[in-house]
């Protein structure tokens, strides 16, 4: 049960993924691929980093716009189309034997509504965090990182809602 992220056609999609470099600045290779995480590496790689920087992108629409050097390897897909829908794998290749962190997230791309009424704050927040706001539940344990956002305070929600609105994305747990 992957966490689902929703974006409208033509907008940017934001798929969160992060790790804590230990020690700080000690970066590890990361890959993003289309399709659930396989046994090793990523299938259908769309973006790959090494210990220093992004070293492989299959398209100019894929970006790491967060603070990569602090472990924010969230993927931004610009100008999404319906074909971008599907499961994506974020794999953090922590050195060691079968030590990788694997995160599967699901992107749902929808056609924009014909008429979009000005959203109220409540509607915006509910679309961004439906389960969190209505039930207080978190997503399933295996999708806590990077997908769901436990213990979010109001300031964080305002910030996150603005980020999501900027990217054209909303979030829901599957």
């Amino acid at each position: 049960s992957e966490v689902e992220y929703i974006a409208e056609v033509g907008q940017n999609a934001y798929l969160p993924c992060s790790y804590t470099p230990a020690p700080p600045g000690n970066l590890v290779p990361v890959c993003w691929g289309k399709g659930a995480c396989p046994v090793f590496d990523c299938s259908n790689v769309v973006l790959r980093t090494d210990n220093r920087d992004v070293n492989d992108r299959t398209s100019g629409r894929y970006w790491l716009k967060g603070d990569f050097h602090k472990g924010d390897v969230s993927l931004t897909i610009e100008n999404v189309t319906l074909a971008d829908s599907g499961v994506y794998c974020c794999r953090i290749q922590i050195p060691g034997i079968m030590n990788d962190e694997k995160h599967n997230v699901k992107l749902v791309v929808i056609k924009p509504a014909k008429v979009t009424p000005a959203p109220t704050l409540q509607r915006d927040l509910t679309s961004a965090f439906p389960r969190m706001l209505t039930t207080g539940e978190h997503g399933p344990a295996e999708t806590q990182t990077p997908g769901s956002l436990p213990d979010v305070n109001l300031t964080q929600i305002f910030t996150l809602t603005n980020e999501l609105r900027d990217s054209g994305a909303t979030i829901r747990t599957a």
């Epitope: 590890v28 290779p29 890959c31 691929g33 399709g35 659930a36 396989p38 046994v39 090793f40 590496d41 990523c42 299938s43 259908n44 790689v45 790959r48 090494d50 210990n51 492989d56 299959t58 290749q93 922590i94 050195p95 060691g96 034997i97 079968m98 030590n99 990788d100």
Partner: antibody, heavy 120, light 107 residues
Framework: EVQLVESGGGLVQPRGSLRLSCAAS????????MSWVRQAPGKGLEWVSA????????YYADSVKGRFTISRDNSKNTLYLQMNSLRAEDTAVYYC?????????????WGQGTLVTVSS | EIVLTQSPGTLSLSPGERATLSCRAS??????LAWYQQKPGQAPRLLIY???SRATGIPDRFSGSGSGTDFTLTISRLEPEDFAVYYC?????????FGGGTKVEIK
């Protein structure tokens, strides 16, 4: 043209050690995960181990975990398999295999194989 | 681990005939399945990956289908060079596993 050439096989006694090498050419070696796959005489294929392009992440079948160590030297375009505590059931042809394009966990190129025989 | 069961174990056919090989997984592997051909004394050769994508240089008489647990490799018209052993391999769940193989022999 992609080429994978294994070496280092031979006859070894039980509980002995052997180191296999695989020299790669014709592709950007450091960009691809690599694997070792073996085939006992007259039997099917068995995946043994894999290593990420950077060499930092390694993966093993339960049958060899703790006894075999996979490694790579990207400056030499070479893959290695250090095999310790060998058993009779490790007797097989060992193939070096390149991971598929875009990270696929299938094998689009294989070496010719090197035979490892464990016997007293 | 995921067990791949290939059937039949041996397929006896004549050149020009159609061959249908089956691979069944003990649990879903999505579309993470590959097919290989192996001839005596040679290394395996990749035919199909991601269940239905043909590898570079593979003739279009080879096709793959299926998802989840049931997969099929079809050779539309057998050529003399197609008589060999065929293996399926899954990469959806650790460890990677191969099927036991199907031998396609000349009738």
């Amino acid at each position: 043209e992609v080429q994978l050439v294994e070496s280092g096989g031979g006859l070894v006694q039980p509980r002995g050690s052997l180191r296999l090498s695989c020299a790669a050419s014709g592709f950007t070696f450091s960009s691809y995960a690599m694997s070792w796959v073996r085939q006992a005489p007259g039997k099917g294929l068995e995946w043994v181990s894999a290593i990420s392009g950077s060499g930092g992440s390694t993966y093993y079948a339960d049958s060899v975990k703790g006894r075999f160590t996979i490694s790579r030297d990207n400056s030499k375009n070479t893959l290695y398999l250090q095999m310790n505590s060998l058993r009779a059931e490790d007797t097989a042809v060992y193939y070096c295999a390149k991971g598929g394009d875009y990270g696929g966990n299938y094998f689009d190129y294989w070496g010719q194989g090197t035979l490892v025989t464990v016997s007293s | 681990e995921i067990v791949l069961t290939q059937s039949p174990g041996t397929l006896s056919l004549s050149p020009g005939e159609r061959a249908t090989l089956s691979c069944r997984a003990s649990q879903s592997v999505s579309s993470y399945l590959a097919w290989y051909q192996q001839k005596p004394g040679q290394a395996p050769r990749l035919l199909i990956y991601d269940a239905s994508s043909r590898a570079t240089g593979i003739p279009d008489r080879f096709s793959g289908s299926g998802s989840g647990t049931d997969f099929t490799l079809t050779i539309s018209r057998l050529e003399p060079e197609d008589f060999a052993v065929y293996y399926c391999q899954q990469y959806g769940s650790s460890p990677l596993t191969f099927g036991g193989g199907t031998k396609v022999e000349i009738k």
